[in-house]
Interface confidence: low
Amino acid sequence: HGTELPSPPSVWFEAEFFHHILHWTPIPNQSESTCYEVALLRYGIESWNSISNCSQTLSYDLTAVTLDLYHSNGYRARVRAVDGSRHSNWTVTNTRFSVDEVTLTVGSVNLEIHNGFILGKIQLPRPKMAPANDTYESIFSHFREYEIAIRKVPGNFTFTHKKVKHENFSLLTSGEVGEFCVQVKPSVASRSNKGMWSKEECISLTRQYFTVTN
């Protein structure tokens, strides 16, 4: 049977909160019958578990088998090419997949206008796969922070950045009118996780939203 097939050049995780996807690059000159076998190792249980015998895609959703990621020492994954009776050597992820590798996201951002202020509320992610007790705020229970980027339309497209330590934030518009667009990027001050910018949410501010106080 040999190992004439080349190995997948690289294997890596791309993960968000309870959305843990393993990716790999295809072998060169793969045929229509080439598929990929995926195995998973949990740190502390030093044996590989076969997860998929023959995936023809270049990614595999491992969320269901890594639900304890946030309470474990992490995982390694490996992938090899299979074509009929031939198979390649394994390619192993070159870093441990742990909570540190999870890219932080927000669920959504809601904006309201109150008397010249924009009040924002950050909704935390609520993935369907997450066990009931594993909420974003229970796993990242301290030092949650959010970078806020504000863009004024019309305008010269310059962004105002500020950092807040709360899922609610207040932006004073200084009496300006127009469309204000807001993006949010989460982080946790005590951790090194990357954060992803949310999609832009916009709200229009017109004169009717201002009340004059003496």
Partner: nanobody, 125 residues
């Protein structure tokens, strides 16, 4: 000296009115935001109203909208809270607060740096 001094609290029947005053030192009156918070026994301190002193823009918590008005008198370096149609659930110690600049949520007590000693408001039904 950095200080905030509240006055105007007292006892009133439900449906009545009170006006609270908060006199600030010059340094504090030049802050960006001043606010009234309240705290009743066994509960967390909650924001009632916030004013942005540079423009007079105001924010109110839902439970007091239409009943309470926050305002300022720049000459007297004073912020007021006019409380009308008072209810028994408005009974609390009322505190004046100020912060020079904040990137945090304005209805969060932790966002504010400077606090007065408080004035008691009791509404009886």
């Amino acid at each position: 000296q950095v200080q905030l001094q509240e006055s105007g609290g007292g006892s009133v029947q439900a449906g009545g009115s009170l006006r609270l005053s908060c006199v600030a030192s010059r340094y504090l009156y030049s802050t960006n935001y001043m606010a009234w918070f309240r705290q009743s026994p066994g509960k967390e301190r909650e924001a009632v109203a916030v004013i942005y002193t540079a423009s007079g823009a105001t924010l109110y918590t839902d439970s007091v909208k239409g009943r309470f008005t926050i305002s300022q008198d720049n000459a007297k370096m004073t912020v007021y809270l006019q409380m009308n149609r008072l209810k028994s659930e408005d009974t609390a110690m009322y505190y004046c607060a100020a912060v020079r600049k904040t990137d945090s949520y304005l209805f969060d007590a932790q966002s504010f740096t400077y606090w007065g000693q408080g004035t008691q408001v009791t509404v009886s039904s």
